[in-house]
């Protein structure tokens, strides 16, 4: 025998009486599939979350993060504070990258400049808090009289962090 509730479309739920009447979802609730025994409570976008899509009787609300924050997790389940390029987020707030490290994103952590000499290359453009160094040809490849920028410390070795 077919479950009478299966006739209840999205946006409704199946009543508990003998007639199994399909009842519209109450305000601030939804059912996205047919045959549901109850409607789900709509997600509320509060605090650092803002509404991207309103809840309807057939679909949940969707949130994103307010300006100055970025989404993490499925369906933007978390919001994390942005920092500027050249910074990283700590518990005490956004801190500038230490000398010899950089961050080219508004999120994440600083990482060390590339050590060009590990690849036998020279530094063509110095690194900054926001940008990695640019490596150029090896010192031996440079024409007489040409000079390259001295590689900055700390050295970045693959598999190691600055301490």
């Amino acid at each position: 025998l077919q479950d009478p509730c299966s006739k209840c479309p999205a946006g409704t739920f199946c009543g508990k009486n003998k007639n199994q009447i399909c009842i519209p979802c109450p305000p601030n609730s939804f059912s996205s599939t047919s045959g549901q025994k109850a409607c789900d409570i709509c997600r509320q976008c509060k605090g650092v979350f803002r509404t991207r899509k309103e809840c309807s009787s057939t679909s949940n609300a969707e949130c994103d993060c307010t300006p100055g924050f970025h989404c993490l997790g499925a369906g933007c389940s978390m919001c994390e504070q942005d920092c500027k390029q050249g910074q990283e987020l700590t518990k005490k707030g956004c801190k500038d990258c230490c000398f010899g490290t950089f961050n080219d994103q508004k999120r994440g952590i600083c990482r060390p400049w590339t050590n060009c000499s590990l690849d036998g290359k020279s530094v063509l453009v110095n690194g900054t808090k926001e940008r990695d160094v640019v490596c150029g040809p090896s010192p031996a490849d440079l024409s007489p009289g040409a000079s390259s920028v001295t590689p900055p410390a700390p050295a970045r070795e693959p598999g190691h962090s600055p301490q």
């Epitope: 993490l72 997790g73 389940s77 978390m78 994440g108 990482r111 970045r156 693959p158 301490q163």
Partner: antibody
Amino acid sequence: QVQLVQSGAEVKKPGESLKISCKGSGYSFSTYWISWVRQMPGKGLEWMGKIYPGDSYTNYSPSFQGQVTISADKSISTAYLQWSSLKASDTAMYYCARGYGIFDYWGQGTLVTVSS
Amino acid sequence: DIELTQPPSVSVAPGQTARISCSGDNIGDQYAHWYQQKPGQAPVVVIYQDKNRPSGIPERFSGSNSGNTATLTISGTQAEDEADYYCSTYTFVGFTTVFGGGTKLTVLG
């Protein structure tokens, strides 16, 4: 939607080499850290290390430094964890996860069994 | 590196409050995060940055972090909360993530 899909279970002998993978999709793979986490049978989570796929910068837990190698190929949105010589004590579930502090997405795990 | 210590197990009756501690030197100076792991599944964030709850995680989950202890509190614990719980922190000394040893939460009855 964001997904991390790991390679299948492996059964190996001590001394053999192994490389397992974690393929990301649904986001800018190059600009998010990927971490690897070990869980030995019946035990807790252990953070092994992380990689920034954009430039393959890696950083290891002192406990795993020199024991494993983490790498990535951003052109195919894949991170790797490899061993050059497996030991029985490497038997564990290995998870990749997106992030360095808050791990918001996890792979389904790769079970590695090392037995003679 | 910082070491995070959790009680191996905590038992609680349904409807009661469960508290899981995570102790480490000055952990209050760093963000603490909490993960729930059920058998055969990958971990899931239940609290991030000390006290923030991801959407979809019930309001009964809350967190705090100061001094040497971070705490996960589950008010009105339900049977479905039975799982392993792990605290973690990212330390800017060594640039590493550390997990606590994990706590098995048992909901009695």
